[in-house]
């Protein structure tokens, strides 16, 4: 028997269902009875979800996995992953045996898309060009690390003193933190840039200081 | 016939570990899972886990996950139980169990466990 | 995880009775199991799938029963069923049994 699944990794968003497929050619006369089909873990061999000799033995992971029944005498052997999280993260074996067996894994990765950066401003009164100010840029519940960049008003890359710090909840989603302190000029945008690197998803966010009182774009 | 013949009786200290065997003979010992299950004395069972010899895969119950280690020889068709850090509760009989869809349908004649400072 | 409270948990009867066992589960199963065990032996598969006799088990024992309610009967008591009986299910993880019934006699 002969196991294949999909070579690139399955990308799923939190809390959407993910089906990580393996399929396997049955020969003629091939009945559910003679099948074993073991999902694991591939790091630790750790079971996911099985069926032996014509019966669904049911998720061992967090009641959250199902096969497709009806399609497994066809050698569909997917699974199905149901409100996926980031801890869920990783690779899994699909384990196939009928006479003989055979085995490949694929690839999980779940992504969450970053919410649209807040921008605030200290000081937020009483600006001067020439004075300093720190912007913070912040945005939320994305997974993974993200990638923060700032531009200026003419899209020149602002890279010194930037400090970014991500931290993660407890449902493993990392809230972004970036701080840019600069020396305000006369008029001056500052936009930050919060990248998804797995979903090539960009969240914008800018702030405009035109003299007094400071503006803050509208939403696209 | 299918056979699962275990490792004979042992006593032990606390804070020892424990390996027993299990042996198996008249069937294709790497397409079954096979369990394990204590049994205190006067007390009822209880599932410790199980693994797949074909590919390695096991589950434990949560309970026993930090002291129970399953594993298998396929070249010897003998799966093992190693316990560690074992206390006076340890002390039971611990059986292995093959299982065919979803019954444990043949067991070892058990491996009686004392843990005694 | 899913529990099974067998009752009673002791049964007085004489050979040539009938006997009940129930197995009742906290959460519905598809399937029940049930197993015998006399002192100083393992277990023995009886039933699967509920209703199904192992090989070799006599027609006097039989199971029934769906959802949260299972039972074991046994038509007529012979001197060699005098064990201990347990229900066990494998709907979801970790597999669990019931905390046996005591079948002795009279």
């Known amino acids: 028997v002969e196991v294949q699944v999909s070579e690139d990794p399955v990308v799923a968003l939190v809390d959407t269902d993910a089906t990580l497929r393996c399929s396997f050619s049955p020969e003629p006369g091939f009945s559910l009875a003679q099948l074993n089909l073991i999902w694991q873990l591939t790091d630790t061999k750790q079971l996911v979800h099985s069926f032996t000799e014509g019966r669904d033995q049911g998720s061992a992971y967090s009641n959250r996995t199902a096969l497709f029944p009806d399609l497994l005498v066809q050698g569909n052997a997917s699974l199905r992953l149901q409100r996926v999280r980031v801890t869920d993260e990783g690779s899994y074996t699909c384990f196939v045996s009928i006479q003989d067996f055979d085995s490949a894994a694929v690839s999980l990765q779940v992504a969450a898309p970053y919410s649209k950066p807040s921008m605030t401003l200290e000081p937020n009164k009483d600006l001067r060009p020439g004075n300093m100010v720190t912007i913070t840029c912040s945005s939320y519940q994305g997974y993974p690390e993200a990638e923060v960049f700032w531009k200026d008003g003419q899209g020149v890359p602002l890279t010194g003193n930037v400090t970014t710090s991500q931290m993660a909840n407890e449902r493993g989603l990392f809230d972004v933190h970036s701080v840019l302190r600069v020396v305000l000029g006369a008029n001056g945008t500052y936009s930050c840039l919060v990248r998804n690197p797995v979903l090539q998803q960009d969240a914008h966010g800018s702030v405009t200081i035109t003299g007094q009182p400071l503006t803050f774009p509208p939403e696209a | 016939q299918v056979q699962l013949v275990q490792s004979g009786a042992e006593v032990k200290k606390p804070g020892e570990s424990l390996k027993i065997s299990c042996k198996a003979s008249g069937y294709n010992f790497n397409n079954y899972w096979m369990h394990w299950v204590r049994q205190r004395p006067g007390k009822g069972l209880e599932w410790i886990g199980m693994?797949?010899?074909?590919?390695?895969?096991?589950n434990y119950n949560e309970r026993f996950k930090r002291k129970a280690t399953l594993t298998v020889d396929k070249s010897i068709s003998t799966a093992y139980l190693q316990w560690s850090s074992l206390k006076a509760e340890d002390t039971a009989m611990y059986y292995c169990?093959?299982?065919?869809?979803?019954?444990?349908?043949?067991w070892g004649q058990g491996t009686l466990v004392t843990v005694s400072s | 995880q899913i529990v099974l409270t067998q009752s009673p948990s002791t049964l007085s009867a004489s050979v040539g009775d009938r006997v009940t066992i129930t197995c009742s589960a906290s959460s519905s199963v598809s399937y029940m199991y049930w197993y015998q065990q006399k002192p100083g032996k393992a277990p023995k598969l009886l039933i699967y799938d509920t209703s199904n006799l192992a090989s070799g088990v006599p027609i006097r024992f039989s199971g029934s029963g769906s959802g949260t309610s299972y039972t074991l009967t046994i038509s007529s008591l012979q001197p060699d069923d005098f064990a201990t009986y347990y229900c066990?299910?494998?709907?979801?993880?970790?597999?669990?049994f019931g905390q046996g019934t005591k079948l002795e006699i009279k």
């Open positions: 066990q299910q494998w709907s979801s993880y970790p597999l669990t």
């Open positions: 169990a093959k299982s065919t869809a979803l019954a444990t349908d043949y």
């Open positions: 693994i797949h010899p074909n590919s390695g895969t096991f």
